[in-house]
């Protein structure tokens, strides 16, 4: 019998500010590049070490941006995304969501070691 | 590839006034940061003034004395040092770093001192007030 992978979805709001390198971060996606199939959302692709978004410690790579400073990026071209980004000023305000993949057992089995529940 | 190389140290006396170049090549100076930092015999390496395209940042220890600029066709930063003084003496540095940011911007803000934040150094420039 097969682990069953299951995903842990959380949605969080970071506020980084602007520093020598920026917010320390890269982004793709958009509706012109979807990076995730089906999903035209803006994703973390990349976190710069020492910027300011590994110093704050909550951003991932793979985090799913949803909105900046209260704008909504669904449905935006890349570039759209990136002018958004642009215009939000010395302090960021990020909504996002994490998705942690969580690893079941196969049903019905208890793993030693593991809570009783 | 990036690289920064710094000018103008030397000796001068009290009193007496340097200006420091800081030539940068492999990317255009007008949207990265540039920083200078400063470290004398035995001490650890100081933050002096941090300048981008849209703020400029000086030490308490040289405000109304140095003054940081940038020219942009020449892709060099200056810092104008003005009334030195013997504990000015140090080896001066420049630095900048690496822009990771969904728009490409980047400014000093107000940690810009964090030697960790920069990427890149020059050689250094020795300066002596003596």
């Known amino acids: 019998m097969n682990g069953r992978v299951d995903y842990l979805v959380t949605e969080e709001e970071i506020n980084l500010t602007r520093g020598p390198s920026g917010l320390g971060f890269n982004i793709v996606g958009g509706t012109d590049q979807q990076y995730v199939s089906n999903d035209s959302g803006i994703y973390v692709s990349r976190i710069k070490e020492n910027g300011a978004a590994a110093l704050d410690g909550r951003l991932q790579e793979g985090d799913k941006i949803l909105s900046v400073n209260g704008q909504d990026l669904k449905n935006l071209l890349h570039q759209d995304a990136v002018d958004l980004f642009r215009n939000a000023g010395y302090a960021v305000s990020l909504r996002v969501q994490h998705r942690l993949q969580v690893q079941n057992g196969p049903i019905g089995h208890r793993g030693e070691g593991d809570p009783s529940g | 590839e990036v690289q920064l190389v710094e000018s103008g140290g030397g000796l001068v006396q009290p009193g007496g006034s340097l200006r420091l170049s800081c030539a940068a090549s492999?990317?255009?100076?007008?949207?990265?940061?540039i920083s200078w930092f400063r470290q004398a015999p035995g001490k650890e390496r100081e933050g002096v003034s941090c300048?981008?395209?849209?703020?400029?940042y000086y030490a308490d220890s040289v405000k109304g004395r140095f003054t940081i600029s940038r020219d942009n066709a020449k892709n060099t930063v200056y810092l104008q040092m003005n009334s030195l003084k013997p504990e000015d003496t140090a080896v001066y540095y420049c630095a900048t770093a690496a822009i990771w940011d969904p728009s490409g911007l980047a400014v000093c803000g107000s940690s810009w001192y964090r030697r960790g934040w920069w990427d890149y150094w020059g050689q250094g420039t020795q300066v002596t007030v003596s």
């Open positions: 492999g990317f255009t100076s007008d949207y990265y940061v």
């Open positions: 300048i981008s395209s849209s703020d400029t």
